[in-house]
């Protein structure tokens, strides 16, 4: 009696169970009563990442430098190429099909989390006592200078964009 289901890594065809091709290989011909499944390795720049009965291998992803992409991990016959973004850029999606420039934190904001190849910069406002006077994708908020520890006094208060200005004691009014 012909089978209705096959074992793992097999497929049903013409009322018989044939072996699937292993990852990295494509199907050339199905098995018969007398022959095994015939498989062939994928060519250069091709891959198949599962046990399969595909007659064509998939093309490796192309990391297009015009889109800011570069190869993070070269593809093999069993794995696709993994793209990432050039330094200072990050992917626009999980599939990393294109890149955008990392966001910079404006003056008055500091970097809470530095961007990675897959996530943008996270900025946070500088609270009182801290400042950032630059637009940067790396700089955190800096603490105001402590005039007291320098035996000076505050001549001008700091803001979220500027440090305090210290001066000598006798300048107190």
């Amino acid at each position: 009696e012909p089978p209705t289901a096959c074992r793992e890594k097999q497929y049903l065809i013409n009322s018989q169970c044939c072996s699937l091709c292993q990852p990295g290989q494509k199907l050339v011909s199905d098995c018969t009563e007398f022959t095994e499944t015939e498989c062939l390795p994928c060519g250069e720049s091709e891959f198949l990442d599962t046990w399969n009965r595909e007659t064509h291998c998939h093309q490796h992803k192309y990391c297009d430098p015009n889109l800011g992409l570069r190869v993070q991990q070269k593809g093999t016959s069993e794995t696709d190429t993994i793209c990432t973004c050039e330094e200072g850029w990050h992917c626009t999606s999980e599939a990393c099909e294109s890149c955008v420039l990392h966001r910079s934190c404006s003056p008055g904001f500091g970097v809470k989390q530095i961007a990675t190849g897959v996530s943008d910069t996270i900025c946070e406002p500088c609270p009182v006592g801290f400042f950032s006077n630059v637009s940067s994708a790396f700089e955190k908020c800096h603490p105001w200078t402590s005039c007291e520890t320098k035996d000076l006094v505050v001549q001008q208060a700091g803001t979220n964009k500027t440090d305090v200005v210290c001066g000598p004691q006798d300048r107190l009014r």
Partner: antibody
């Protein structure tokens, strides 16, 4: 110990000005911020602004720019807030409080004056 | 400006009750560099100036009874009175001091049931 003593209650006519004082003792006046807060009758607290007496640096709530002016006299350890062009809606209790002391970690108001009631009425 | 929203606006409770007041800010008050929440709680009795209870969201001001405690982080904060005493009937305010202008919650009045 730290103490902030404010001037007494005032009754003013609409359009006039008033100057509220806040005398500080028990700490270094020049290096600690003086904060000004108001409370209208039956209402909540509203921050007006602050002054660092030693430098004269000020911060104003946008809402009170042109209404309040802060000054300080370090020789007498007294801070002043002048309110101009008074209207009936300026009727409130005005408080001074001590803010940060130069350490940049004490921005909360740990000592308060007793409050000055300013009544604006024709 | 950072908005502060307190709830409830009033609460009726009895002596010995546990009372919880919440405060929500319109932006995070947690600063990543020092891991501090820029939030204070004050108590105000009728005709009196406010009194500082809690600063940095959870630090108890010197001289304040330990039945008062503050908790929370980011945008959601709580003031808890573990066992309400007769002298605790008052109005409570949260206030942020993250960036100018400082703003207060609208207040929560704790009344006798």
């Amino acid at each position: 110990q730290v103490q902030l003593v404010q001037s007494g209650a005032e009754v003013k006519k609409p359009g006039s000005s008033v100057k509220v004082s806040c005398k500080a003792t028990g700490y270094t006046f020049s290096t600690s911020w003086i904060e000004w807060i108001r409370q209208a009758p039956g209402q909540g607290l509203e921050w007006i602004g602050s002054i660092l007496p030693g430098s004269g640096s000020t911060n104003y709530n946008e809402k009170f720019k042109g209404k309040a002016t802060f000054t300080a006299d370090t020789s007498t350890s007294t801070a002043y807030m002048e309110l101009s062009s008074l209207r009936s809606e300026d009727t409130a209790v005005y408080y001074c409080a001590r803010g940060d002391d130069g350490s940049y970690v004490r921005w909360y108001f740990d000592h308060w004056g007793q409050g000055t009631l300013v009544t604006v009425s024709s | 400006d950072i908005q502060m929203t307190q709830s409830p606006s009033s609460v009726s409770a009895s002596v010995g009750d546990r009372v919880t007041i919440t405060c929500r800010s319109s932006q995070s008050l947690l600063f990543s560099v020092n891991q501090k929440n820029y939030l204070a709680w004050y108590q105000q009795k009728p005709g009196k100036a406010p009194k500082l209870l809690i600063y940095w969201a959870s630090s108890l001001q010197s001289g304040v009874p330990s039945r008062f405690s503050g908790s929370g982080s980011g945008t959601d904060f709580t003031l808890t009175i573990s066992s309400l005493q007769p002298e605790d009937f008052a109005t409570y305010y949260c206030q942020h001091y993250y960036s100018y202008p400082w703003t207060f919650g609208q207040g929560t009045k704790v009344e006798i049931k």
